[in-house]
């Protein structure tokens, strides 16, 4: 598993560097998670042909993965910092159950899957410090999450592989959009 942000050898070699600003820390954290997703996608793509599959729509119907929309205020047109921040945090909290699903889906990258899950928690905490209106954030209902997880785990092997691929792809896209938006804040 890659080394978490702030713990790489360069940090040890340069102890007199300025501490990271909150924005820099968030940026670094997202890039770290994206690196982890790349490693997981590599294993998924090596294991099955999902990455070239055109049958994604079949599995996508089952999933309600968070996506950025115009109304979320994260795109350049109609950008709204607070609305966007609420969307990013809400989306990450919604992704948590899907990251839980990923935990038993990897053989050689088991640690990496756990690192992505834990690093996402850290990212949520960083972002919460930045948000002004936590009351606008709706957390996922655990009962709904439990039935979703049960449903995903009961799928046949092909659908589970497709679900894994779709979660990783959607999470990557969501984080990339978040990164672009956060760089405007």
């Amino acid at each position: 598993a890659p080394v978490p942000p702030g713990e790489d050898s360069k940090d040890v070699a340069a102890p007199h560097r300025q501490p990271l600003t909150s924005s820099e820390r968030i940026d670094k954290q997202i890039r770290y998670i994206l690196d982890g997703i790349s490693a997981l996608r590599k294993e998924t793509c090596n294991k099955s042909n999902m990455c070239e599959s055109s049958k994604e729509a079949l599995a996508e119907n089952n999933l309600n993965l968070p996506k950025m929309a115009e109304k979320d205020g994260c795109f350049q047109s109609g950008f709204n910092e607070e609305t966007c921040l609420v969307k990013i945090i809400t989306g990450l909290l919604e992704f948590e159950v899907y990251l839980e699903y990923l935990q038993n889906r990897f053989e050689s990258s088991e640690e990496q899957a756990r690192a992505v899950q834990m690093s996402t928690k850290v990212l949520i905490q960083f972002l919460q410090k930045k948000a002004k209106n936590l009351d606008a954030i709706t957390t996922p209902d655990p009962t709904t999450n439990a039935s979703l997880l049960t449903k995903l785990q009961a799928q046949n092997q092909w659908l589970q592989d497709m679900t894994t691929h779709l979660i990783l792809r959607s999470f990557k896209e969501f984080l990339q959009s978040s990164l672009r938006a956060l760089r405007q804040m």
Epitope: E96, V97, K121, Q125, D135, I137, T139, P142, N145, A146
Partner: nanobody
Framework: QVQLVESGGGLVQAGGSLRLSCAAS????????MGWFRQPPGKVREFVGR???????NYADSVKGRFTISRDNNNNTVYLQMNRLKPEDTAVYYC????????????WGQGTQVTVSS
């Protein structure tokens, strides 16, 4: 499995306040979400509010602005502060814990009775 024990219930007049506590014991207490529910007499159990692992709180519309959930991680306790109580808040109040993001509420307390008289 986490054991949850509620306390702080009782009889209070309309407009008054009560603070319920939910103390957890058992394995390491760092649940994904802690929730409060209530069951009014002759009705089904309903959601009151929840606090997730990162401290974000959500409430049922019927209690918004009157009830506040907080937690003390050092004492493994979650609280429900109830202000401006109404007779329709009369119920048995339960706390519940969801240990992981996909586990649902997998631990429940026995409940504590709250009666609001008019």
């Amino acid at each position: 499995q986490v054991q949850l024990v509620e306390s702080g219930g009782g009889l209070v007049q309309a407009g008054g306040s009560l603070r319920l506590s939910c103390a957890a014991s058992g394995r390491t207490f760092s649940p994904y979400t802690m929730g409060w529910f209530r069951q009014p007499p002759g009705k089904v159990r309903e959601f009151v509010g929840r606090i997730n692992w990162s401290g974000i709180r959500n409430y049922a519309d019927s209690v918004k602005g009157r009830f506040t959930i907080s937690r003390d991680n050092n004492n493994n306790t979650v609280y429900l502060q109830m202000n401006r109580l109404k007779p329709e808040d009369t119920a048995v109040y339960y706390c519940a814990a969801a240990s992981q993001s996909g586990s649902g509420y997998d631990s429940w307390g026995q409940g504590t009775q709250v009666t609001v008289s008019s």
